[in-house]
C-alpha cells in the first residue's frame, strides 16, 4: 500500500488585492481516514484557515464538493484577498484520533498579493495616452 502524499502543485501564487486566490491541494489516497486542514505558517503559532469538518470560514470555499465520498481534491478558494493574507499556506492531512493526529503536510504555497491597479482618466491634454498607462498602487 503506497504511503499517502499531499500535493500542493504551485510553490507560489500571486493575486491582485480584492480578487480570489485558489490554493490547490490533492491527496493521493483516501485512507487513512481523517480530515484535511489548511494553515498559514508553520509551528505552534500557525493560523487555521480552513477545517474540513468544523468551524465557520466565511471567506473560504472548497473548490470541489467535499461531500463526494471519493473526493481527493482539497483545494480552496479564498475571496476578497488583502495584503494581510500574504504568507505560505499548507494543506495538512490528519489521521483520525482523539485528538486527530497530523499525518502529512503539503510543501506549501506562498501567496503574494499585488496591489489593486486603478487607472487615471484625463480628458484633456497631449499626454492622455501616456497618463492612461500610469498605475496607481493602493496598499
Amino acid at each position: 500500500e503506497e504511503e499517502l502524499q499531499v500535493i500542493q502543485p504551485e510553490k507560489s501564487v500571486s493575486v491582485a488585492a480584492g480578487e480570489s486566490a485558489t490554493l490547490n491541494c490533492t491527496a493521493t489516497s483516501l485512507i487513512p481516514v481523517g480530515p484535511i486542514q489548511w494553515f498559514r505558517g508553520v509551528g505552534p503559532g500557525r493560523e487555521l484557515i480552513y477545517h474540513q469538518k468544523e468551524g465557520h470560514f466565511p471567506r473560504v470555499t472548497p473548490v470541489s464538493d467535499p461531500t463526494k465520498r471519493n473526493n481527493m481534491d482539497f483545494s480552496i478558494r479564498i475571496s476578497n484577498i488583502t495584503p494581510a493574507d500574504a504568507g505560505t499556506y499548507y494543506c495538512v492531512k490528519f489521521r483520525k484520533g482523539s485528538p486527530d493526529v497530523e499525518l502529512k503536510s503539503g510543501a506549501g504555497t506562498e501567496l503574494s498579493v499585488r496591489a489593486k491597479p486603478s487607472h487615471h482618466h484625463h480628458h484633456h491634454g497631449l499626454n492622455d495616452i501616456f497618463e492612461a498607462q500610469k498605475i496607481e498602487w493602493h496598499e
Epitope: 483516501l30 485512507i31 481516514v33 469538518k53 468544523e54 464538493d65 461531500t67 465520498r69 482523539s98
Partner: antibody, heavy 118, light 109 residues
Framework: EVQLVESGGGVVQPGGSLRLSCAAS????????MSWVRQAPGKGLEWVAG????????YYPASVKGRFTISRDNSKNTLYLQMNSLRAEDTAVYYC???????????WGQGTLVTVSS | SYELTQPPSVSVSPGQTARITCSGG??????YAWYQQKPGQAPVTLIY???KRPSNIPERFSGSSSGTTVTLTISGVQAEDEADYYC???????????FGGGTKLTVLG
C-alpha cells in the same frame, strides 16, 4: 431546528415501483450529503443509498444497486428514493438521514413504511 | 448478515455502567457512530466520529475506540436508557455505511 419528513410510503405489489420523498428544513440542504436507511420489521438498520450535496455522485449497497435510485432537488429542499422491481424483502420503514462531514448520520426523519405484498 | 459485530443484549442495573462493543471494521478506513432507538421511534444519534457527542446528548453517553473495536459507555444508567443501540460505520474503502445487528439494553429492576 433540523427537520426531515418522509412521505410516499404505502403498499405495493412485488415487481412494482414507489417513490419516496424527504422534505428537509432547518439547515442548508444544498450543503449536506444525504442518505436513506431502512429497517425491516423486527430487524436492524440497513443503509440503502447516499448522495453528495450537489447530487452528482450516488452510492448504493449491492442489495439495491440497479433497482433503487437516489436523487435530490436542492431548489425544493427535497430528497427522493425511486424504488423499482420491489421485492417482499424490501418491506421496511425507510428513514432519510442527514450526513456528517465524514458520512455518518446526525439527524433522522421519522420514517415512512413501505410494504411489498401481493 | 451484518458487517459490524455487537452483542445482541446487555443487562445492567440502574446507576451502573453499561458498555456495548462493536468490531469488524478496519481502523484506518472506518469512522464509527452509535445510534439509540426506542420502540416505534426513529433512531437518535448518540455518538459520531468514534467519540464525538452531539450537544443535545447527555454526558453519560460516551464513545471510545481501541484498534478495531469501538465502545459505547453509558454511565449511571437510567430506566429511560432501555432501548436498542446500533453501531454504524462509514467505510472509506467501499464508500458504504455498514451497521451492526443492534444491542438490546435492558435496565434491570
Amino acid at each position: 431546528e433540523v427537520q426531515l419528513v418522509e412521505s410516499g410510503g404505502g403498499v405495493v405489489q412485488p415487481g412494482g415501483s414507489l417513490r419516496l420523498s424527504c422534505a428537509a428544513s432547518g439547515f442548508t440542504f444544498s450543503s449536506n450529503a444525504m442518505s436513506w436507511v431502512r429497517q425491516a420489521p423486527g430487524k436492524g438498520l440497513e443503509w440503502v443509498a447516499g448522495i453528495s450535496a450537489g447530487g452528482s455522485d450516488t452510492y448504493y449497497p449491492a442489495s439495491v444497486k440497479g433497482r433503487f435510485t437516489i436523487s435530490r432537488d436542492n431548489s425544493k429542499n427535497t430528497l427522493y428514493l425511486q424504488m423499482n422491481s420491489l421485492r417482499a424483502e424490501d418491506t421496511a420503514v425507510y428513514y432519510c438521514a442527514r450526513e456528517t462531514w465524514n458520512h455518518l448520520f446526525d439527524y433522522w426523519g421519522q420514517g415512512t413504511l413501505v410494504t411489498v405484498s401481493s | 448478515s451484518y458487517e459490524l459485530t455487537q452483542p445482541p443484549s446487555v443487562s445492567v442495573s440502574p446507576g451502573q455502567t453499561a458498555r456495548i462493543t462493536c468490531s469488524g471494521g478496519s481502523y484506518s478506513s472506518y469512522y464509527y457512530a452509535w445510534y439509540q432507538q426506542k420502540p416505534g421511534q426513529a433512531p437518535v444519534t448518540l455518538i459520531y466520529s468514534d467519540d464525538k457527542r452531539p450537544s443535545n446528548i447527555p454526558e453519560r453517553f460516551s464513545g471510545s475506540s481501541s484498534g478495531t473495536t469501538v465502545t459505547l459507555t453509558i454511565s449511571g444508567v437510567q430506566a429511560e436508557d432501555e432501548a436498542d443501540y446500533y453501531c454504524g460505520g462509514y467505510d472509506q474503502s467501499s464508500y458504504t455505511n455498514p451497521f451492526g445487528g443492534g444491542t438490546k439494553l435492558t435496565v434491570l429492576g
